[in-house]
Amino acid sequence: QPSVSPGEPSPPSIHPGKSDLIVRVGDEIRLLCTDPGFVKWTFEILDETNENKQNEWITEKAEATNTGKYTCTNKHGLSNSIYVFVRDPAKLFLVDRSLYGKEDNDTLVRCPLTDPEVTNYSLKGCQGKPLPKDLRFIPDPKAGIMIKSVKRAYHRLCLHCSVDQEGKSVLSEKFILKVRPAFKAVPVVSVSKASYLLREGEEFTVTCTIKDVSSSVYSTWKRENSQTKLQEKYNSWHHGDFNYERQATLTISSARVNDSGVFMCYANNTFGSANVTTTLEVVDKGFINIFPMINTTVFVNDGENVDLIVEYEAFPKPEHQQWIYMNRTFTDKWEDYPKSENESNIRYVSELHLTRLKGTEGGTYTFLVSNSDVNAAIAFNVYVNTKPEILTYDRLVNGMLQCVAAGFPEPTIDWYFCPGTEQRCSASVLPVDVQTLNSSGPPFGKLVVQSSIDSSAFKHNGTVECKAYNDVGKTSAYFNFAFKGNNKEQIHPHTLFTP
């Protein structure tokens, strides 16, 4: 019994004065607590407690279930204890079969012994199966067997407490360990689509998938900058013991423009949190926006190729696309395709391939596209650059020499005089009259220029050159003059092409 200094309150004393007492089943348990300030006896086993206000605890016929810790407490709150084993060969274990463990923590298999003198107190697997190799335990006859550092792999492990009694192995009732996994990473969250574009009145539905080791992961849909509780529907699955998946589906049955915004799927566990967002844009009606990828005014050289390219945004998706020129629809030479294969793609590309363009093929090329809500169009003005062509070169009755040339861009006509037989005409002659004529051809076709000079200025034999040129090239026509007496005659005109 403990000894204390005089004057200080002392713990009660218990008879018999030993820490452990072994009695046989059916025998009497008689425990006496001596203390002037006696309050109560308390009996504890397997988390169950009983009290007795008598200072003598008497159990006439002891049973195995009377095994446990008997504590006497006085008015000062001081106490003393004795542990009683009631030896019963037919009931070697007291058991509480409820067995839970947390991963990486210790857990107690509650199977205290009724006889401390049995040997080899340990754990065994059910049905003769071995225990996991890494399972470590510490036996305590008064409490049970402590499994150290529970592993996830021990979940639903079936086991018995075991002792050797008179050379034979005796097993307790079965226990099945239920393990709660430790969260060692944040939940994995993903969303069905990163962005949604809807028309007013359409249904918005988005699904967040949450994956974790346990169903106790918390998840919710939140609207950014809003506290409103959103309506969610759930579907969940256990793919084995520690592979849990939940789908949280958020639905707005009839979306409005003011529902537009960012929605966040948030999940957390004891390790940390994770989130993923999706953007909703609700428009009052559909739209088409066209973006030319080249300038809408196009200059191309005669015989060359050009691609007219547009990108366009269309929502809802485009239903009809066409390219038109001179009120005629192209049936081929063009292609239309989505900018990306992404499910939420609203951007498309259309390309018209014009090959070996002729001077007569300039004009307005129009791309038209429509969906169920709107139509849209864009026009390209295509100009075909052509080298000048001299259409006419004549000596008029009034003595004028006239040269008419066509080309694009608008040709310039210069006049030169070559005296005698010289090949090079260097002396320039100023025209009397220059006019740009209206072409009878299509718009964007060649421009026609007429230029005249007065032939009376020429007093000697020679050649007059009419040279028409632009950025693309040049062409010349020639007038030959010969004087017979006082008469001037025009000899046949001819043209030369100078590249």
Epitope: S98, Y100, I176
Partner: antibody, heavy 118, light 111 residues
């Protein structure tokens, strides 16, 4: 004696809340996982929610997740089910049940009736 | 979720005769620990359910030995060797391998 007694049921309008209680006696409540199971009129049994012995682990059937909350007070030997945003389809007799060592329900309360009606 | 399907849904039996109820699961209920997480319950008229069989074949405390459970994986059977009048009620199978689900119930009645 060993028993579970539910209370807190009643008639409630859709969208409103109700809290059910389950008082345990005759056993060490804090050592057991506890469940709620319901039974709609004339229908079969449907599991609703579970809570571990210490309150750390909880799970719910998908149809009540986010609306119902299971909790326990081991010092009062009482299990609770907080039911928010109630719907007509939540109308049922609600039973609390104790989970034994083999994860079976070895003890059931007598049930409490919840009627959700406008 | 694992779907539990019971048959028959109604079972009229003469007292003293045997009875058998089948329960099939949409996936195996056999855990790596060797146990089938399949339980049987009886709900007598006007009463709460009571546990009859746990882990596929183990009789619960106080359950008469005329009740027996068998089967493994996805196919399970509850047998009553000789039906008595007090056995009337609805029998449910329940899986506890994953999120708990019940069968739709089999009503046993006396002919």
């Amino acid at each position: 004696q060993v028993q579970l007694v539910e209370s807190g049921g009643g008639v409630v309008q859709p969208g409103r809340s109700l809290r059910l209680s389950c008082a345990a006696s005759g056993f060490t409540f804090s050592r057991y996982g506890m469940h709620w199971v319901r039974q709609a009129p004339g229908k079969g049994l449907e599991w609703v929610a579970v809570i571990w012995y210490d309150g750390t682990n909880k799970d719910y059937t998908d149809s009540v997740r986010g609306r119902f909350t299971i909790s326990r007070d081991n010092s009062k030997n009482t299990l609770y089910l907080q039911m928010n945003s109630l719907r007509a389809e939540d109308t049922a007799v609600y039973y609390c049940a104790r989970e034994d060592w083999a994860e079976a329900f070895d003890m059931w309360g007598q049930g409490t009736t919840v009627t959700v009606s406008s | 979720d694992i779907v539990m399907t019971q048959s028959p849904l109604s079972l009229p039996v003469t007292p003293g005769e045997p009875a058998s109820i089948s329960c099939r699961s949409s996936q195996s209920l056999l855990h790596s620990n060797g146990y089938n997480y399949l339980d049987w319950y009886l709900q007598k008229p006007g009463q709460s359910p009571q546990l009859l069989i746990y882990l596929g074949s183990n009789r619960a405390s106080g359950v008469p030995d005329r009740f027996s459970g068998s089967g493994s994986g996805t196919d399970f059977t509850l047998k009553i060797s000789r039906v008595e009048a007090e056995d009337v009620g609805v029998y449910y199978c329940m899986q506890a391998l994953q999120t708990i689900t019940f069968g739709q119930g089999t009503r046993l009645e006396i002919k």
